[in-house]
């Protein structure tokens, strides 16, 4: 058993048929010694008396808010939550496996630049009686500070008969050093509590591996005189790290015909302009990636040829 | 470079960008193969990293690029020695068309651009003997290449910025 926060405790249980459970001793936080009784949640049933209560915690029916009383007045509360371990593996019932970039990916994180700011998100089909909180650090054995904001409900989607909820959090490394080579990974820990079930999820990454630039901005087409060609130009996204002579991007450009089946020629360039043949009804697209490290490509930015 | 002269920024830029390409072709992102699951806070401590105080940021380069260039050169020599060690030459053998050979040569080439013959900066101690098991060697190769990708990315940024802003 360990304390999650004041008056909230997590009991770790091996979860199998006829498991013995855990013996837990609760102590009433009061100077009083006599006339103390204990109840669980709203049931008025007295579970025991005295300053301490010893219980065997085996199942969810044994979890909940234990209250000690004297003379009809509540003296203190202890909320017990259960953390299930089945076959040596902690339960992951609350969050959905996003399966990207690999199986058992419950948390996904992205950064738009090297400033030390990043966003993580996760999915669940549960919404009632649910709590999420987040902590983060750089490194685990001698952790350096990362400050996370409050978790937000960032999207609701209908998937067949089910509603899916997306939650997200933004974090910022306290002393980020954008130009340095990261040595220790960022650790993100999400606590999830559904009713009386506690679970925790972690993700470990380097900022460099979760970089995904915003799409290039200000796409412009300039037709060239007496030619089928056009000059296309674009700019670095505003959110990308500066100076651009140091934090450089590379670009992938393509012209896409109206039909999705039409062959697309992709061209890679470090410049912010190119000359292409842009037929009527086609569209020109460009995406960006860090020039020196193969993290994710941005989403495409597009503009019609006509 | 030693004694405060400027490097051939443009040449260094070209070669460092080539190093980035080679490092990624030697070990592409194998489905985001997570090599940090091996308790990695310790395993990467012995490789040289370009850290915050090394002056490799744009301001540090403007003030005095020598600290940063020395750190980059130390790293290049360290990785060059690693790629020439039995971690990479032992079993399992590299494929004949493996870019590791080119990568090895390019590391050497860039380190020499930063220190012409006759100058000697102290270099870091070369790592301990390689593991005996082929599978351990393979895992170590992946880790070294992943670490090298991060190192050469910073080096390439330094030279790109130098070529754009510090070239005479």
């Amino acid at each position: 058993i360990w304390e999650l926060k004041k008056d909230v405790y997590v009991v770790e249980l091996d979860w199998y048929p006829d498991a013995p459970g855990e013996m837990v001793v609760l102590t009433c936080d009061t100077p009083e010694e006599d006339g103390i009784t204990w109840t669980l949640d709203q049931s008025g049933e007295v579970l025991g008396s005295g300053k301490t209560l010893t219980i065997q915690v085996k199942e969810f029916g044994d979890a909940g808010q234990y209250t000690c009383h004297k003379g009809g007045e509540a003296l203190s509360h202890s909320l017990l939550l259960l953390h299930k371990k089945e076959d040596g593996i902690w339960s992951t019932d609350v969050l959905k496996d996003q399966k990207e970039p690999k199986n058992k990916t419950f948390l996904r994180c992205e950064a738009k630049n090297y400033s030390g700011r990043f966003t993580c998100w996760w999915l669940t089909t549960i919404s009632t009686d649910l709590t999420f909180s987040v902590k983060s650090s750089r490194g685990s054995s001698n952790p350096q500070g990362v400050t996370c904001g409050a978790v937000t409900l960032s999207a609701e989607r209908v998937r067949g008969d089910n509603k899916e909820y997306e939650y997200s959090v933004e974090c910022q490394e306290d002393s980020a050093c954008p130009a340095a080579e990261e040595r220790l990974p960022i650790e993100v820990m999400v606590d999830a509590i559904h009713k009386l079930k506690y679970e925790n999820y972690t993700s470990s990454f380097f900022i460099r591996d979760i970089i995904k630039p915003d799409p290039p901005k200000n796409l412009q087409l300039k037709p060239l005189k007496n030619s089928r060609q056009v000059e296309v130009s674009w700019e670095y996204p505003d959110t990308w790290s500066t100076p651009h002579s140091y934090f450089s991007l590379t670009f992938c450009i393509q012209v896409q015909g109206k039909s999705k089946r039409e062959k697309k020629d992709r061209i890679f360039t470090d410049k912010t302009s190119a000359t292409v043949i842009c037929r009527k009804n086609a569209s020109f697209s460009v995406q960006a990636q860090d020039r020196y490290y193969s993290s994710s490509w941005s989403e495409w930015a597009s503009v019609p040829c006509s | 470079v030693p004694g405060g002269s400027s490097p051939a920024w443009a040449q260094c830029q070209q070669l460092s960008q080539k190093l980035c390409t080679l490092a990624w072709s030697a070990h592409p992102l194998v489905g985001h193969m997570d090599l940090r699951e091996e308790g990695d806070e310790e395993t990467t401590n012995d490789v040289p990293h370009i850290q915050c105080g090394d002056g490799c940021d744009p301001q540090g380069l403007r003030d005095n690029s020598q600290f940063c260039l020395q750190r980059i050169r130390q790293g290049l020599i360290f990785y060059e020695k690693l790629l020439g060690s039995d971690i990479f030459t032992g079993e399992p053998s590299l494929l004949p068309d493996s870019p590791v050979g080119q990568l090895h040569a390019s590391l050497l080439g860039l380190s020499q651009l930063l220190q012409p013959e006759g100058h000697h900066w102290e270099t870091q101690q070369i790592p301990s003997p390689s593991p005996s098991q082929p599978w351990q060697r393979l895992l170590l190769r992946f880790k070294i290449l992943r670490s090298l990708q991060a190192f050469v990315a910073v080096a390439a940024r330094v030279f790109a910025h130098g070529a754009a802003t510090l070239s005479p």
Epitope: V8, L79, D129, T131, F132, V151, I193 | -
Partner: nanobody, 122 residues
Framework: EVQLVESGGGLVQAGASLRLSCAAS????????MGWLRQAPGKEREFVAT????????YYADSVKGRFTISRDNAKNTVYLQMNSLKPEDTAVYYC???????????????WGQGTQVTVSS
């Protein structure tokens, strides 16, 4: 730390509307998720609604969905609960609460107001 003071409660007829306000003191108001919770006599405290620090997607308990609306004004350090089509079963003490977690549970809010009584007569 944040201090919370609720107002706007009162006695109304079924079908009527009320607007509760919660004024927060402390510069950090805009960084907290805010919730409304309620407790009817002899019952457990129950979750009503929550709104994120950035005034993003609100979330409601099924019992109030479509009738109640939570909103916030970060410039005024205030969170509101607009209650329409009130029913006798909405009678309770309504509490405003703040948390750094996201929660649709009445158990995990860090800071609480003193509460304001809402009574709906039939």
């Amino acid at each position: 730390e944040v201090q919370l003071v609720e107002s706007g409660g009162g006695l109304v007829q079924a079908g009527a509307s009320l607007r509760l306000s919660c004024a927060a003191s402390g510069r950090t108001f805009r960084s907290y998720n805010m919730g409304w919770l309620r407790q009817a006599p002899g019952k457990e405290r129950e979750f009503v609604a929550t709104i994120s620090w950035n005034a993003g997607i609100p979330y409601y308990a099924d019992s109030v969905k479509g009738r109640f609306t939570i909103s916030r004004d970060n410039a005024k350090n205030t969170v509101y609960l607009q209650m329409n089509s009130l029913k006798p079963e909405d009678t309770a003490v309504y509490y405003c609460a703040a948390s750094n977690s996201w929660s649709s549970s009445a158990r995990f809010y860090d800071y609480w107001g003193q509460g304001t009584q809402v009574t709906v007569s039939s």
